[in-house]
Interface confidence: medium
């Protein structure tokens, strides 16, 4: 017996009625006395509703189910589920038995729209640029769990420092609270979008914050103009200073270091104490020098991924900020030179000379020269590959026709460190092998 149900889940809003469609094709002469119809929960086999011995046996499921009795004889075995709850979600099996037997399962997907988010700000008074605030976006009584996205006023995603929690109430409906921690700029719009993935329903809220500027003028924050260059694996100091006024105490100071582009928090000093590193526990302040206006940040065991711009925000009564660039570098190893072919070489032979130098950063510049210092630019192929640490291995290949004799040298330059590493190979006019045999 062929039993038909919808392939896609039946989506039902909490509190509404849902129809779980199920049908079969009755043969001529079919009467309801021959019909056994059973609806049950697919997983637990719990009885939901049944029609046997020619009559409706009623609901075994909280008295919230009904059959379409007037349509049963035409093969409509659908089940009506009233006042849908979250707990109803799942698979229901429709068993039909006449002389023969058939069954099929239909999925019920429960949903509830999320409310328009309410936005709250903490603190919400006397805000100044440079203050750290938490913006909370709350949306209620939705199902299933929501997806939450934050954006700035230009539509750019805000992904750093977001914490989202979702709590189900007794009915199984979720309240979602998403908290964005952000350092205020001169002004800004922050918006949160709460999506119900089943209903494809979006609820959004936004908040525009215009911090007050104090009339006394901004704090002047000083950082080096030039990038700070740091070797991979060493410690770097990102210098930042301000001029404290007479009577200044650390209790008045809010100091925040963050990544300029992503606004990710790196380190902070607020409420009179060091709040510690939010950046892989590799940062520290010079606490004994803070009161003198030294807001510098120490970054330990520098990695390639640290490269970029760091912003130093200083807020006392007023606010100031400045960005300092960190340029990461690593010296290239002395190049190793290989020759191919490397046996029985004669003038007129074409050879490839490979110059390899390892674990440098940033990408190298490679120059080839002959024995007189003249550049060799033709037939050079240079490739640079980064390893997991982001350090580059450089391989430069020179293809050349041997003269009577000649020296070929390769210079690998680190453009940041202005460090040159070079290697050379000398090929004489006699038949020879490389490297020369002892």
């Amino acid at each position: 017996l062929e039993v038909q149900v919808p392939e896609d889940p039946v989506v039902a809003l909490v509190g509404t009625d849902a129809t779980l469609r199920c049908s079969f094709s009755p043969e001529p002469g079919f009467s309801l006395a021959q019909l056994n119809l059973i609806w049950q929960l697919t997983d637990t086999k719990q009885l939901v509703h049944s029609f046997t011995e020619g009559r409706d046996q009623g609901s075994a499921y909280a008295n919230r189910t009904a059959l379409f009795l007037d349509l049963l004889a035409q093969g409509n075995a659908s089940l009506r589920l009233q006042r849908v709850r979250v707990a109803d979600e799942g698979s229901f099996t429709c068993f039909v038995s006449i002389r023969d037997f058939g069954s099929a399962a239909v999925s019920l997907q429960v949903a509830a729209p999320y409310s328009k988010p309410s936005m709250t700000l903490e603190p919400n008074k006397d805000l100044r640029p440079g203050d750290t605030v938490t913006i909370t976006c709350s949306s209620y009584r939705g199902y299933p769990e929501a997806e939450v996205f934050w954006q700035d006023g230009q539509g750019a995603p805000l992904t750093g420092n977001v914490t989202t929690s979702q709590m189900a109430n007794e009915q199984g409906l979720f309240d979602v609270h998403s908290v964005l921690r952000v350092v205020l700029g001169a002004n800004g719009t922050y918006s949160c979008l709460v999506r119900n993935p089943v209903l494809q329903q979006d609820a959004h809220g936004s908040i525009t914050i215009t911090p007050q500027r104090s009339p006394t003028g901004a704090v002047e924050v000083q950082v080096p103009e030039d990038p700070v260059v740091a070797l991979v694996g060493t410690d770097a100091t990102l210098r930042c200073s301000f001029s404290p006024e007479p009577g200044f105490s650390l209790a008045q100071l809010n100091l925040i270091w963050q990544l300029t582009d992503t606004k990710q928090l790196v380190h902070s000093f607020t409420e009179g104490r060091d709040q510690g590193s939010a950046y892989a526990n590799r940062t520290a302040l010079f606490l004994d020098l803070l009161a003198q206006g030294n807001a510098s940040l120490r970054l330990q065991r520098v990695r390639v991924a640290d490269e970029g711009s760091f912003t130093c925000f200083v807020s006392i009564r007023d606010f100031g900020s400045a960005a300092v660039s960190l340029q990461v570098a690593a010296p290239y190893s002395k190049p190793s030179m290989t020759l191919e072919p490397n046996k029985d070489l004669r003038p007129g032979d074409t050879v490839t000379i490979t110059c390899s130098s390892y674990r440098g950063y940033p990408e190298a510049e490679v120059f080839w020269q002959d024995g007189q210092g003249a550049p060799l630019t033709g037939n050079v192929t240079t490739s640079q590959m980064a390893n997991e640490q982001g350090l580059f291995d450089v391989h430069s290949v020179l293809r050349v026709v041997l003269g009577a004799n000649g020296t070929y040298s390769c210079l690998v330059r680190n453009p940041v460190l202005q460090q040159d590493a070079h290697g050379s190979v000398t090929i004489t006019g006699q038949p020879m092998t490389f490297p020369p045999e002892a």
Epitope: E147, F149, Q151, G153, Q154, G155, A156, P157, T159, G185, A186, T189, S191, C192, L193, R195, P197, Q200, D202, H204, S206, D261, T262
Partner: antibody, heavy 121, light 106 residues
Framework: EVQLVQSGAEVKKPGSSVKVSCKAS????????IHWVRQAPGQGLEWMGY????????DYAQKFQGRVTLTADKSTSTAYMELSSLRSEDTAVYYC??????????????WGQGTTVTVSS | EIVLTQSPDFQSVTPKEKVTITCRAS?????MNWYQQKPDQSPKLLIK???NLASGVPSRFSGSGSGTDFTLTINSLEAEDAATYYC?????????FGQGTKLEIK
């Protein structure tokens, strides 16, 4: 009519730099961010970064960090994209595009006509 | 980085056919935009915010989806729809495009 008009085609040598301009008209230049997207011959679209002409805030795709500089001149409603240390793989059509919309939905609604940059020795 | 994978890469179709292009994101995104690019032209906005038609776009185009799976549908294809179609997200940095789906009219 809202328009973005880009500078003409450029032929450059490897290792050199190129600066492409994008002049906006028909709308308030400082109200929308300008993004730069490139397309290598026969390839898809690749985002390079954007600038907020009002605040001059920029954000770059990691791949171009350190090689691309985006600037904007409010007085002439012109955005600029400079790409340095050019290599042959940078041969592409470079587009500027206006990122428009309103919270929370945004999209590229106006594109420049594209500037072809050819890098060849 | 959220990677957008479009399928198919290429499709050859006859006029009046229905065409479906899918765009799958490597993690959940808030919405998807779609662009049409004809040879030697700049891209043009087609669908904004998953399902909203851009101004001047014929009603035979439609978009749907959520989470990680999004679809662009062209009902009753016309000859002028021969182009490459791209999906785009910016729910997470960096902004990314799909690799493109080229539609050829038979």
């Amino acid at each position: 009519e809202v328009q973005l008009v880009q500078s003409g085609a450029e032929v450059k040598k490897p290792g050199s730099s190129v600066k492409v301009s994008c002049k906006a008209s028909g709308y308030s230049f400082t109200s929308y961010t300008i993004h730069w997207v490139r397309q290598a011959p026969g390839q898809g679209l690749e985002w390079m970064g954007y600038i907020n002409p009002n605040s001059r805030n920029t954000d770059y795709a990691q791949k171009f960090q350190g090689r691309v500089t985006l600037t904007a001149d409010k007085s002439t409603s012109t955005a600029y994209m400079e790409l340095s240390s050019l290599r042959s793989e940078d041969t592409a059509v470079y587009y500027c595009a206006r990122y428009s919309g309103s919270t929370p939905y945004w999209y590229f609604d106006v594109w420049g006509q594209g500037t072809t940059v050819t890098v060849s020795s | 980085e959220i990677v957008l994978t479009q399928s198919p890469d290429f499709q050859s179709v006859t006029p009046k056919e229905k065409v479906t292009i899918t765009c799958r994101a490597s993690s959940s995104v808030s919405y998807m935009n779609w662009y049409q690019q004809k040879p030697d032209q700049s891209p043009k906005l087609l669908i904004k915010a998953t399902s909203n038609l851009a101004s001047g776009v014929p009603s035979r185009f439609s978009g749907s989806g959520s989470g990680t799976d999004f679809t662009l549908t062209i009902n009753s294809l016309e000859a002028e729809d021969a182009a490459t179609y791209y999906c785009q997200q910016w729910s997470s940095n960096p902004l990314t495009f799909g690799q493109g789906t080229k539609l050829e009219i038979k």
